[in-house]
């Protein structure tokens, strides 16, 4: 299973649920669905309040039980380490795959943390991060921001990923903006 890691803003906008959580239990495989279930302890929710309701608590995250069909494998054995998890809701359950954005909270830049906490949501409605994977690539719309990190750095951990968000500048126009300047 291969997929291009998304810009964190894309991950935020395309996910039903974005939370901070610790992986606390041994994974279990469901004998009916063939999904693997990880027990988690949610510490923060950044997106999904409407979908879940205010009192909701996510206790498990689900993923296919085999790598070749994009199952997510959690490598960390540190049960106190917090992870940012951006996933999809299916029948009220949080699902993730290899292609989902799952990252140690401590590995995120301060700008990314700010993005997940409050800024990425501003760009979800109108703006689109548009991946540039090969030259030439050009903007197809004024609401697109060209994402060139992978082209220039060969990595999703480039400057645009770590420090910028694609946000509305004016109606019909989105531009890369520094998340540093978004401090309230």
């Amino acid at each position: 299973c291969t997929c291009v890691p998304p810009h964190p803003q894309t991950a935020f906008c395309n996910s039903d649920l974005v939370i901070r959580a610790k992986f606390v239990g041994t994974p279990e495989v469901n004998q009916t669905t063939l999904y693997q279930r990880y027990e988690i302890k949610m510490t923060k929710m950044y997106k999904g309040f409407q979908a879940l309701g205010d009192a909701a608590d996510i206790r498990f995250v689900y993923t296919p039980a085999m790598e070749s069909v994009c199952g997510y494998f959690h490598r960390s054995h540190n049960r106190s380490e917090e992870f940012l998890i951006a996933g999809k809701l299916q029948d009220g359950l949080l699902h993730i795959t290899t292609c989902s954005f799952v990252a140690p909270w401590n590995s995120l830049s301060l700008a990314q943390r700010r993005g997940f906490t409050k800024t990425y949501t501003v760009g979800c409605e109108e703006c689109t991060v548009f991946p540039c994977l090969s030259i030439p690539c050009k903007l197809q719309s004024g609401t697109h921001c060209l994402w060139t990190d992978q082209l220039l750095q060969g990595s999703e951990k480039g400057f645009q990923s770590r420090h910028l968000a694609c946000l509305p500048r004016e109606p019909g126009l989105c531009t890369w903006q520094s998340l540093r300047s978004q401090i309230a």
Epitope: P27, T32, T33, Y35, P64, A65, M66
Partner: antibody, heavy 113, light 111 residues
Amino acid sequence: QVQLVESGGGLVQPGGSLRLSCAASGFTFSSYAMSWVRQAPGKGLEWVSGISGNGVLIFYADSVKGRFTISRDNSKNTLYLQMNSLRAEDTAVYYCARWFDVWGQGTLVTVSS
Amino acid sequence: DIALTQPASVSGSPGQSITISCTGTSSDVGGYNYVSWYQQHPGKAPKLMIYDVSNRPSGVSNRFSGSKSGNTASLTISGLQAEDEADYYCQSYDFVRFMVFGGGTKLTVLG
């Protein structure tokens, strides 16, 4: 009682195709993932393929990926394995299993010219 | 391509206890509590004897027990009987290969 009965095995030439069936009874078929496991003559067990209860998730061993297709018909309580581009090394007794707790008696597939 | 390592053969006299080991890695045996053991008599289908490391299905004699330490699982048969003579296979869940088996162990009951 819980029962699985395989059928469809036989002699086939290399490059040929065969479709195995597994008729299930005695339990709620759609509530269980099912698997195919094979055993070459005088050898050990090898997992081949698996399918979730609703047929949404499907897994294959690398040795059969792209050649074998697993499917199920929950209305008929039947599991299938479509085997294409068969090779001599696919010769084995093929068992269907409910998850891995109940097994059928197996059906022999021989690939030979 | 055998994923889990079992001794090719073990033997014991009636009434004795024997143990069959099954060694994997932290990615299979060591990483999950999904180890099963099967008994297979010649020309017959495998029969589940132990699941989830140490659980016995109903109808299986309590002379059969399972355990796990690190990356190695074990099947112990106490009070060995003639009908225990068979091949025994261990199996484990593995995230990459889904389900992996050991190469099998031939148990011979002496005498």
